[in-house]
């Protein structure tokens, strides 16, 4: 027999066995040109000393073979003795070590058997009623196909599925969607209506994440506020990575879960932008403000569950950094300025009303004054901090106020609003005999003492009404009692108390008269 022809004789070996695990597999035969044909197959097992024979039986009942040696691919023409217009059955017999192994057969019309391509290029993946929908452009001149898919998870082997017949310029497939594990899909096609024709190769892997992105399990820590008024947010625990099927472990797109950090600055609500989303890898610096932080997981199907934390405001206060002067025209704050053209956000809130919204003012970008200070003023009519109560004041600064992560804390302090001099006057001053020449003076704490760092000291004044002699006694802001000594019996005295701040002398309390009774001896 000529090598280019199919030999119509009995093959030169004994009967074959098709039951072994090794042997020829996946035979596919198709037309490659107007008169040219090709068959190819896989061989599993040791290849040394294996000879392959492509067998063919015609509709006439005659059978022939091509001897291909060690090759697992054969090309032949329509003149090779194989009928290409009628149905034929083809299979491979592989002979080695005195035994022959046989492939499954294919029965087809060679002329109609066109080598179909798998889905090529971009396979679009979407979710449809709890299922996975894949869609792709039909390869050129190959409209009319039967399509199969296979899929696996990280822990399962391939499972085969059917997409059904396709007859359009775009083809699609509905596949099962897993809730909590990633899947790898591959698709293949063959000519519609020719059951014996060969399947295309499998497509490149399509990697599909689980329907539910995993709950992000992460932990944060916040560093101390630095001298620059910023503190670093650091990730203590990375989110766990999704387990992937074998074909998706490289840089296969589509299966990845992205984690984003959503930052919401709760302080200073009058600024331009309160929320910023950034990749989890870019851990930001924060001001000393309070924030809500959310980690949002998302995949190609959209966002999944998120995890939210509250980062409380840094409560460290600078009692001396802020200067407040109250004049007839209004009130002005002064503080050490930052760089040129800095925007400041001044926020204040009555102490004890932290749940309510803070009052907030944004300055126009300002440069430091000649003394290196920044200022903010308001008129008395505005009513700002006009009530006689303690306010917590925080000042934030940014050269780029629209960029949430570029704000820093300038200072955080307390201020007593309204007429602090009068409001701070101590009440309920009482005098009690202490000994023969001393008394104990007590008073109710000044309202200023509710304002951390505001009350500098109490001053107790004692006047001898006989001699008009006056003595003043400074008292620590934490004390509300003092002992006056070296007093004379029978002399009338008046006592008054005032509360002073760093920048303001308080008003004296109502004079309280007392005297020590003369002791009469028996």
């Amino acid at each position: 027999c000529r090598t280019s022809e199919c030999c119509f004789q009995d093959p030169p070996y004994s009967d074959a066995d098709s039951g072994s695990a090794s042997g020829p597999r996946d035979l596919s035969c198709y037309r490659i040109s107007s008169a040219g044909y090709e068959c190819s197959w896989q061989y599993e097992g040791p290849t040394a000393g294996v000879s392959h024979f492509l067998r063919c039986c015609l509709s006439s009942g005659r059978c022939c073979y091509f001897a291909t040696g060690s090759a697992t691919r054969l090309q032949f023409s329509d003149q090779a003795g194989v009928s290409v217009l009628h149905t034929v059955t083809l299979w491979v017999e592989s002979w080695a070590r005195n035994r022959t192994e046989k492939s499954p057969e294919v029965t087809l019309q060679l002329y109609k058997s066109v080598k179909y391509k798998p889905p090529l290029g971009d396979i679009k993946v979407s979710k449809l009623a709890g299922q996975l929908r894949m869609e792709w452009e039909t390869p050129d001149n190959q409209v009319g196909a039967e399509v199969q898919f296979r899929h696996r998870t990280p822990s399962s082997s391939w499972k085969l599925g059917d997409c059904g017949p396709q007859d359009d310029d775009t083809e699609s497939c509905l596949c099962p969607l897993e809730m909590n594990v990633a899947q790898e899909f591959q698709l293949r096609r063959r000519r519609l209506g020719s059951q014996g024709s060969s399947w295309s190769k499998w497509s490149s892997p399509v990697c599909v994440p689980p329907e539910n992105p995993p709950q992000p399990q992460v932990r944060f820590s916040v560093e101390q506020l630095g001298r620059d008024g910023r503190r670093r947010l650091t990730l203590k625990e990375q989110p766990t990575q999704l387990e992937l099927p074998e074909g998706c472990q490289g840089p296969a797109p589509g299966v990845e879960v992205t984690y984003q950090l959503q930052l919401h600055m709760l302080s200073c609500p009058c600024k331009a932008k309160a929320t910023r989303t950034l990749p989890l890898e870019k851990m930001p610096y924060l001001s000393g403000a309070a924030y809500n932080v959310a980690v949002i997981s998302s995949n190609r199907f959209g966002p999944g569950p998120n995890q939210t934390w509250h980062i409380p405001a840094d409560t460290h206060t600078e009692p001396v950094a802020l200067n407040i002067s109250v004049g007839t025209n209004g009130t002005t704050m002064y503080w050490p300025a930052r760089a040129q053209s800095t925007t400041y956000c001044i926020e204040w809130q009555p102490v004890g009303q932290e749940g309510s919204l803070a009052t907030c003012n944004l300055t126009a970008p300002q440069d430091p004054d000649p003394a290196g200070m920044a200022t903010y003023s308001w008129s008395r009519e505005s009513g700002a901090m006009g009530q006689e109560k303690c306010y917590h004041i925080t000042i934030f600064a940014s050269a780029h106020p629209k960029k949430l992560t570029l704000w820093s804390t300038v200072l955080s302090t307390y201020h007593f609003g309204g007429n602090a001099s009068a409001a701070g006057t101590p009440h309920h001053v009482s005098v009690k005999n202490h000994s023969l020449d001393s008394v104990s003076v007590d008073w109710a704490p000044s309202l200023l003492s509710t304002c951390p760092g505001v009350l500098k000291e109490y001053v107790v004044r004692c006047r001898d009404e006989d001699s008009n002699q006056v003595s003043e006694h400074p008292v620590q802001p934490t004390e509300t009692q003092v002992t006056l000594s070296d007093l004379r019996a029978g002399v009338a005295y008046t006592v008054q108390v005032r509360a002073d701040t760093a920048w303001l002398r308080g008003a004296w309390s109502q004079p309280q008269r007392f005297s020590i009774k003369v002791q009469v001896s028996d």
Epitope: S18, T87, W91, P104
Partner: nanobody
Framework: QVQLVESGGGLVQAGGSLRLSCAAS????????VAWFRQTPGKEREFVAS????????NYADSVKGRFTISRDNAKNTVFLQMNSLKPADTAVYYC????????????????WGQGTQVTVSS
């Protein structure tokens, strides 16, 4: 040498069903194509159905299409012919045959043959 033994024949009323079995002795039966033929007295053997060794290809005579089904169980070295909606014209001796080749049509020469089993369909 492959030895084939048919069983399952018998008498059945028109419209009824029978299942024929063809058991083989050879270990390499799973690499053989198997066909069923039938013969009535004074006539040539007539092709009924065939199945490839993998079970992936089957072929039927026009006269039995839609009524008969050929299948195989390679683990048991057996091929079956399920015959439904039987007609009196299906009365014949049914033979199974085996060959290393699978023929894609009714034509083909089979190397090994069984002794046959009688199927009678009464009206």
């Amino acid at each position: 040498q492959v030895q084939l033994v048919e069983s399952g024949g018998g008498l059945v009323q028109a419209g009824g069903s029978l299942r024929l079995s063809c058991a083989a002795s050879a270990r390499i039966f799973n690499s053989y194509a198997v066909a069923w033929f039938r013969q009535t007295p004074g006539k040539e053997r007539e092709f009924v159905a065939s199945i490839s060794w993998s079970g992936g290809s089957t072929n039927y005579a026009d006269s039995v299409k839609g009524r008969f089904t050929i299948s195989r169980d390679n683990a048991k070295n057996t091929v079956f012919l399920q015959m439904n909606s039987l007609k009196p014209a299906d009365t014949a001796v049914y033979y199974c045959a085996a060959d290393r080749n699978y023929y894609p049509s009714v034509l083909g020469k089979y190397t090994y043959w069984g002794q046959g089993t009688q199927v009678t369909v009464s009206s």
